[in-house]
Interface confidence: low
């Protein structure tokens, strides 16, 4: 009898664009054909996907967030066929360049400022807000009630993924008008990624990591 196969992996939590993953269909069986399925479809070999050892070993040369699977392997001989339970990869990735919402850059004096930051990341990233280069809080949402012209400035959302060791940020220049006219939507927006953060955030990056690890 053919045993029900199972998949072993050398790395179930690979990092996107960095790690390779080897999936092995177990056990070794003689006079047996090995088959693979990804997302319920027969495997299509590509430059990033390699089969070896008589199709028993599947190698993903550089994983992406789209490579989670599920993966199944099958074994068959002239008498029967068996298929493994599915295995999924927990691909860690990001954080992508964050998005601050709402997109408004101009606010009326006395209004509430309620900014939310989101970055695609696995696992979810750590969020921090910096205002004019000063670290304010470690939350995904920044709320300031009854803003005034004193609240003008550069609002930066900084995201960090400790699993990938990567970080990212975006800056929005927000202005507060004291007039009665409706505020316009003009303004400047800049984003920084990884080590390319603006100089004013460098000290805060160090402080943030220090704060997080201790």
């Amino acid at each position: 009898e053919l045993p029900k196969p199972y998949i072993s992996s050398n790395n179930s939590n690979p990092i996107e664009d960095k790690d390779a993953v080897t999936l092995t269909c177990e056990p070794v069986a003689e006079n047996t054909t090995y088959l693979w399925w990804v997302n319920n479809q027969s495997l299509s070999v590509s430059p990033r996907l390699q089969l070896s050892n008589g199709n028993r070993i599947l190698t993903l040369l550089s994983v992406t967030r789209n490579d989670t699977g599920p993966y199944e392997c099958g074994i068959q001989n002239s008498e029967s066929a068996k298929r493994s339970d599915p295995v999924t990869l927990n691909v860690t990735y990001g954080p992508d360049t964050p998005i601050i919402s709402p997109p408004d850059l101009s606010y009326r004096s006395g209004a509430n400022l309620n900014l939310s930051c989101h970055s695609d990341s696995n696992p979810s990233p750590q969020y921090s807000w910096l205002i004019n280069g000063t670290l304010r809080q470690h939350t995904q949402v920044l709320f300031i009630s009854k803003i005034t012209s004193n609240n003008n400035g550069a609002y930066a959302c900084f995201v960090s993924n400790l699993a990938t060791g990567r970080n990212n940020s975006i800056v929005k220049n927000i202005s507060v008008s004291s007039g009665d006219s409706a505020p316009g939507s003009s303004g400047l927006s800049a984003s920084g990624s990884g080590s390319g953060l603006n100089d004013i955030f460098e000290a805060q990056k160090i402080e943030w990591h220090h704060h997080h690890h201790h």
Epitope: E1, P3, K4, N40, G69, P70, S80, K82, T88
Partner: antibody, heavy 120, light 107 residues
């Protein structure tokens, strides 16, 4: 035509034991993984046992683990379910089911069921 | 264990109508979902597996869709023989679990 015929369902007291059988015909029984699925009086379906085509691999849910065993005799085209330490919540219609060939997933063929009642 | 939540618990419809039954998984099951039909006093019969693949002999008025955690079974132009109970089941490894069922009755 695929046929699965369960038997052995009776009234049994709590703590008692019972062995169900499922006679298969109309397909190559020895090539198919098999399961037992039960349907409670509330009409809920619950999977209770799995056995690979050759009988070497079995799986059970936590609710019956250690109390139920599953076996098969491919020479006789028969599947068995041994149920020990029966509880009132084991009362159900028990179906044997054949998985899709080469798969441990969906249940392609079902028997007509046999009623097991556990009551004092 | 993966929990399967099915809705509605019951619905009434007339011959010729189109109905949809939904099933939600407590975690990502990709496309590993099956649907069964059960008529009164009979055993369940496989309708659909792998979310949308019709089992042998199942009429094309049945169709399955969805992925991840949200799935649905649609029956176009209901026929008298379609009335009964319907169950979803994940086949994303053991333990296999079923939804609580949807009873489809004639209006």
């Amino acid at each position: 035509e695929v046929q699965l015929q369960e038997s052995g369902g009776v009234l049994v007291k709590p703590g008692g034991s019972l062995k169900l059988s499922c006679a298969a015909s109309g397909f190559v029984f020895s090539s198919y993984d098999m399961s037992w699925v039960r349907q409670t009086p509330e009409k809920r379906l619950e999977w209770v046992a799995y056995i690979s085509s050759g009988g070497g691999i079995t799986y059970f849910p936590d609710t019956v683990q250690g109390r139920f065993t599953v076996s098969r005799d491919n020479a006789k085209n028969t599947l068995y379910l041994q149920m020990n330490s029966l509880k009132s919540e084991d009362t159900a219609i028990y179906y044997c089911a054949a998985h899709y060939f080469g798969s441990s997933g969906p249940f392609a063929y079902w028997g007509q069921g046999t009623l097991v009642t556990v009551s004092a | 264990d993966i929990q399967m939540t099915q809705s509605p618990a019951s619905l009434s419809a007339s011959v010729g109508e189109t109905v949809t039954i939904t099933c939600r998984a407590s975690e990502n099951i990709f496309s590993y979902l099956a649907w069964y039909q059960q008529k009164q006093g009979k055993s369940p019969q496989l309708l659909v597996y792998n979310t949308k693949t019709l089992a042998e002999g199942v009429p094309s008025r049945f169709s399955g869709s969805g992925s991840g955690t949200q799935f649905s079974l649609k029956i176009n132009s209901l026929q008298p023989e379609d009335f009964g109970s319907y169950y979803c089941q994940h086949h994303y490894g053991t333990p296999f679990t079923f939804g609580s069922g949807t009873k489809l009755e004639i209006k």
